[in-house]
Interface confidence: low
């Protein structure tokens, strides 16, 4: 027989020789590291057929580490499932925790023993400061100075000085987020006032009102023979302007060889429209405009169009 | 100057075996995880094997395990991946690179070519 | 076929913002294990963009940054400049093999 076979977990006792005679036996014991457990053989003899008889080294078990608890608010989750040297044991906090320490520990081999590669981690409660204080309005909770993990705060504005109340612009409500920061900036406090918004040729169908404050909405519809050129819904944004801006109503051209049919009816309808000088982010038509001749606008058929697709 | 110098590229046949060094410069590899990653021409990159740093755990990709072996010596600085028995797939970009989960450091790479 | 999912290429025009998704399984990513970022510039080394998630190592801009949610995570880039053109590849780990994704090529237009 040539050489006999090596294995991961045993190791041949005396130095192998180039060739072995039939019926010569040679010996293994475990590596460093690994340990025996009867009654699985360690040795092999040379076969009449010039081969080594079965062998394995399964009777080997791998040094295993010592064992981990869970940290407190966290799981110690082995690699494989195993404690065995070679092997790692990660770590993972619950939800409202952060690791502080090593996410992963080796299980490593010092000598013949099996030791961790450090200290276990600890889950640390996520904690935040207080959140930003802003001009002219308040926060629950203020007089609070450490947020756990979802503690939410509630952001209202002062009552104003003048005429007009302070807006609340943004979002509310924030809360203490997984990383110990604020789910997001906190909102603003300001006074927004749009002006009244003036449609020659049309009229206001909602959103009545004398002063026009921050979400404030309102429609339009043109007048008979004139069509809406822009949104027929407008919102006051936090900038105190309208958007999309203010639209118009302009007149429908008579028909003629070049120009597109007149209208037995009103252009005016609550649905939303649009053309293309308005604004892209205003809503989508709800009607073929009846021009014909403004680019990306279907031509009319047989003179008629119809006020709703 | 914190740095991984790689030599030991070249054609080689078909059957045969290469040496990779990584010689690092401004730390030294035993207090750190080494591996090494190669990436195919015109191909993504490929995990190929990893050393522990106190050198006794080693970790194989399934497409080098019996063939390569990763090895280093702490009184060179320095990292080996031995490569017998190449093979047409193995040519490829070889990096070696430090550190544990993630790679903060990479050589600059060395090219393997397996060709008849 | 890489065990991580990313999308053959992006693009943006300067300015912009792109992201990148990573999609791995419940033995990867969705098994806890960190999520890092590669960013590879033509003809050089990779370097290491984010690491453990969503951290950024010194000297890279707080333009680049990750996300993990499940199995799958990201990474987005505001502000896109010329110079952010490479190809970016996300790595994770699942017992005993460190993962790549299939890489993702990054064109600004």
């Known amino acids: 027989c040539e050489e006999p076979p090596t294995f991961e977990a045993m190791e041949l006792i005396g130095k192998p020789k180039p060739y072995y005679e039939i019926g010569e036996r040679v010996d293994y014991k475990c590596k460093k590291g690994y340990f025996y457990i009867p009654p699985l053989a360690t040795h092999t003899i040379c076969d009449r057929n010039h081969t080594w008889l079965p062998v394995s080294d399964d009777a080997c078990y791998r040094e295993t580490c010592p064992y981990i608890r869970d940290p407190l608010n966290g799981q110690a989750v082995p690699a494989n499932g195993t404690y065995e040297f070679g092997y790692q044991m990660h770590f993972i906090c619950n939800e409202g925790y952060y690791l502080i320490g090593e996410e992963i520990l080796y299980c490593e081999l010092k000598g013949s023993v099996a030791i961790w590669s450090g200290k276990p981690p600890i889950c640390e409660k996520v904690l935040c400061t207080p959140p930003p204080k802003i001009k002219n309005g308040k926060h629950t909770f203020s007089e609070v100075e450490v947020f756990e993990y979802l503690d939410a705060v509630t952001y209202s504005c002062d009552p104003a000085p003048g005429p007009d109340p302070f807006s609340l612009i943004g979002e509310s409500t924030i809360y203490c987020g997984d990383n110990s920061v604020w789910s997001r900036a906190a909102p603003e406090c300001k006074v927004v006032k749009c002006r009244f918004p003036v449609v020659e040729n049309g009229k206001q169908i909602s959103g009545f009102g004398k002063k026009f404050y921050y979400k404030a909405t309102v429609m339009f519809e043109c007048d008979k023979g004139f069509y809406l050129d822009g949104s027929d819904t407008i919102v006051c944004d936090s900038n105190s302007t309208w958007d999309p801006p203010v639209p118009k109503c302009l007149k429908v051209l008579p028909p003629s060889s070049t120009k597109p049919p007149a209208l037995s009816h009103s252009v005016s309808t609550s649905s939303t429209t649009k053309s293309p000088a308005s604004s892209a982010s205003g809503p989508r038509p709800t009607y073929k405009p009846p021009v014909s001749n403004y680019p990306g606008y279907p031509k009319p058929e047989e003179g008629i169009l119809d006020s709703l697709d | 100057q914190v740095q991984l110098v790689q030599s030991g590229g070249g054609v080689v046949q078909p059957g045969r075996s290469l040496r990779l060094a990584c010689a690092a410069s401004?730390?030294?590899?035993?207090?750190?995880?080494m591996h090494w990653v190669r990436q195919a021409p015109g191909k993504g990159l490929e995990w190929v094997a990893v050393?522990?740093?106190?050198?006794?755990?080693?970790y194989y990709a399934d497409s080098v395990k019996g063939r390569f072996t990763i090895s280093r010596d702490n009184s060179k600085n320095t990292l080996y991946l031995q490569m017998n028995s190449l093979r047409a797939e193995d040519t490829a970009v070889y990096y070696c690179?430090?550190?544990?989960?993630?790679?903060?450091?990479w050589g600059r790479g060395t090219l393997v070519t397996v060709s008849s | 076929q890489s065990v991580l999912t990313q999308p053959p290429s992006v693009s943006g025009a300067p300015g912009q913002r792109v992201t990148i998704s990573c999609t791995g399984s419940?033995?990867?990513?969705?098994?806890?294990?960190?999520v890092h970022w590669y960013q590879q510039l033509p003809g050089t080394a990779p370097k290491l963009l984010i690491y453990?998630?969503?951290n950024r190592p010194s000297g890279v801009p707080d333009r680049f940054s990750g996300s993990k949610s499940g199995t799958s995570a990201s990474l987005a880039i505001t502000g896109l400049q010329a110079e952010d053109e490479a190809d970016y590849y996300c790595?994770?780990?699942?017992?005993?093999?460190?993962?790549f994704g299939g890489g993702t090529k990054l064109t600004v237009l």
């Open positions: 690179a430090k550190g544990g989960g993630y790679f903060d450091l």
């Open positions: 401004g730390f030294t590899v035993n207090n750190y995880a």
């Open positions: 050393i522990s740093y106190d050198g006794n755990n080693k």
């Open positions: 419940s033995s990867n990513i969705g098994a806890g294990y960190d």
């Open positions: 453990g998630d969503n």
């Open positions: 790595s994770s780990y699942t017992s005993g093999t460190w993962l």
